[in-house]
């Protein structure tokens, strides 16, 4: 194999390389023959917008349709592939942006041919276009910084083509990172191009290089962990939330509290009841019961769902949120309307909190 | 066209085995990652496992983990799920279930297989 | 693992309605989820991937959106058809965990 020397997220020559020059490499979209393909050119500002295909100035045609920043190219075939170019002509410059297309049908059979993502297909390996790795999707890789909570799960991608099909392999701060680098080791899935670490720890900071090569070239990029550890507090929920409902006798609604909390919450629904007639104990605390919380046997504890409400449901329903630093909690009204009103959304008002001891 | 075509299911006592097998069709099924997902009566889904095109990485959730083995035999476009120490709480209808290459959604799915474990 | 939460767990709408489902999941997981339909006694059909792409073959009234935590799935103009339980699923861990579903029936 050739050598390398590792220079951030570049295009690695090798000590022959395979082209004469080669400043970034373009996207690549893949059609199949007789499919459409739709390109949008990826500049900001472009006023006029000028197309070239290997050099050559591109203009419509029967198949070809130029509309602003959009280039179509309806039932394409294989002469339509090759290196094409969107130029924005501004007042005082003009910036190029290279793309290739190649249409062929060696994409993988039973494959979905309306793919627009374009980074799934590849050229078939045993075809004669030998060709150095390239980046087929770019926007997934656009998030270098991860800072990310203690306990979470990381997954850095580096989606890849090139002919032969390039091999993948990832470097922690420059270095082989190996299995036995991290407790419980990290997941490699080759078909994604992803490197997968669960529950990281503070140790797992660093910088994690994915290195594509094949026997034409290598490509690198470099990602950047940071891991936030957490600090405790008391649930937080999302303002606005239980919101205030209003149904008519017999219908349905459901209250939804959003929880944030790194320690395990604990969720409790809670409705102010009646006993005697009276809604106070003699002790002066009001009566409660707990309608739902979370546990084994509770399915999305952050919902209360009522279903075919009567009058007796009507009244202040609470989402009291606990966990081992402390609690928190919010209320929303429900009003039952007699059959004969139409049900309507109140205006959503939060309730003040009531902070239950 | 593809297709997916389980079978294998069928009524088991507990701590016993069964071998689900998943017939491919319509497509190279070496390129592509599979999955088994399985329903329990009047339940939702859950993942249960997934294997590489090239069967260089599996991985299984953690209900089943130690228990069941996913396979695959691309000579015979074949998938296959060994299912061993069986519970009650495995019962289930098991789809095996095509990966779209690098977006990890479910396009293909077979008929699913209904597996009971009862004594 | 990481948990994806659904809500509602189910909803009454009526043809031509606009119907909204929510996905939580309980981290960053990205644009890396897939929504579902799945009618009594079949198979789950893919409608989208990675939170936003419609599947081939499915109608644009289906939509889905989000990133991180929070997603969407929007049916614009609700048609017989559609009343089924829809599922979400995250593919950011190992582990492909599902929502426990929503489901959409006849009001």
């Known amino acids: 194999r050739p050598s390398f020397s590792l220079v951030e997220d570049t295009t690695l020559e090798p000590e022959e390389p395979p082209t004469k020059y080669q400043i970034s490499q373009p996207e690549v979209y893949v059609a199949a023959p007789g499919e459409s393909l739709e390109v949008r050119c990826l500049l900001k500002d472009a006023a006029v917008i000028s197309w070239t295909k290997d050099g050559v100035h591109l203009g419509p045609n029967n198949r070809t349709v130029l509309i602003g920043e959009y280039l179509q190219i309806k039932g394409a075939t294989p002469r339509d592939s090759g290196l094409y170019a969107c130029t924005a002509s501004r007042t005082v410059d003009s910036e190029t942006w290279y793309f290739m297309v190649n249409v062929t049908d060696a994409i993988s059979s039973g494959d979905d041919e309306d793919d627009t993502d374009g980074a799934e297909d590849f050229v078939s390996e045993n075809s004669n276009n030998k060709r150095a790795p390239y980046w087929t999707n770019t926007e997934k890789m656009e998030k270098r910084l991860h800072a990310v909570p203690a306990a979470n799960t990381v997954k850095f991608r580096c989606p890849a083509g090139g002919n032969p099909m390039p091999t993948m392999r990832w470097l922690k701060n420059g270095k082989e990172f190996k299995q036995e680098h991290r407790i419980g080791g990290y997941k490699v899935r080759n078909q994604h191009w992803s490197l997968i670490m669960e529950s990281v720890v503070p140790s797992d900071k660093g910088n994690y290089t994915c290195v594509v090569e094949n026997e034409y070239g290598s490509i690198n990029h470099t990602y950047h962990l940071d891991v936030v550890e957490r600090s405790p507090h008391r649930p937080i929920l999302q303002a606005g939330l239980p919101a205030n409902a209003s149904t008519v006798v017999g219908g349905d609604v459901e209250f939804v509290c959003k929880v944030y909390s790194d320690a395990q919450p604990h969720i409790q629904w809670i409705k102010h009841v009646e006993k005697n007639g009276s809604k106070y104990g003699p002790d002066g605390l009001p009566y409660l019961k707990v309608l739902k919380h979370s546990g084994i046997n509770s399915s999305n504890a952050e919902v209360l769902a009522l279903f075919n409400v009567t009058e007796a449901d009507a009244g202040e329903y609470i989402c009291k949120v606990s966990n081992y630093i402390g609690q928190a909690n919010q209320s929303a009204w429900l009003t039952v309307l007699p059959k004969q009103q139409a049900p309507g959304r109140e205006k959503e008002i939060t309730a003040s909190p009531d902070y239950l001891e | 066209e593809v297709q997916l075509l389980e079978s294998g299911g069928g009524l088991v006592q507990p701590g016993g085995s069964l071998r689900l097998s998943c017939a491919a069709s319509?497509?190279?099924?070496?390129?592509?990652?599979m999955s088994w997902v399985r329903q329990a009566p009047g339940k939702g889904l859950e993942w249960v496992s997934v294997?590489?095109?090239?069967?260089?990485?599996?991985h299984y959730a953690d209900s089943v983990r130690g228990r069941f083995t996913i396979s695959r035999d691309n000579s015979k476009n074949t998938l296959y799920l060994q299912m061993n120490s069986l519970r009650a709480e495995d019962t289930a209808v098991y789809y095996c279930?095509?990966?779209?290459?690098?977006?990890?959604?479910?396009?293909?799915w077979g008929q699913g297989t209904l597996v009971t474990v009862s004594s | 693992d990481i948990q994806m939460t659904q809500s509602p767990s189910s909803l009454s709408a009526s043809v031509g309605d606009r119907v909204t489902i929510t996905c939580r999941a309980s981290?960053?997981?990205?644009?890396?989820l897939n929504w579902y339909q799945q009618k009594p006694g079949k198979a789950p059909k893919l409608l989208i991937y990675?939170?936003?792409n419609l599947q081939s073959g499915v109608p644009s009234r289906f939509s889905g959106s989000g990133s991180g935590t929070d997603f969407t799935l929007t049916i614009s103009s609700l048609q017989p058809e559609d009343f089924a339980t829809y599922y979400c699923q995250q593919h950011y861990s190992p582990s492909h965990t599902f929502g426990q579903g929503t489901k959409v029936e006849i009001k």
């Open positions: 319509g497509f190279t099924f070496s390129d592509y990652a």
């Open positions: 990675d939170a936003s």
């Open positions: 981290q960053d997981i990205s644009s890396d």
């Open positions: 279930a095509r990966e779209r290459t690098y977006s990890s959604a479910f396009d293909y």
């Open positions: 294997i590489e095109g090239d069967a260089s990485y599996t």
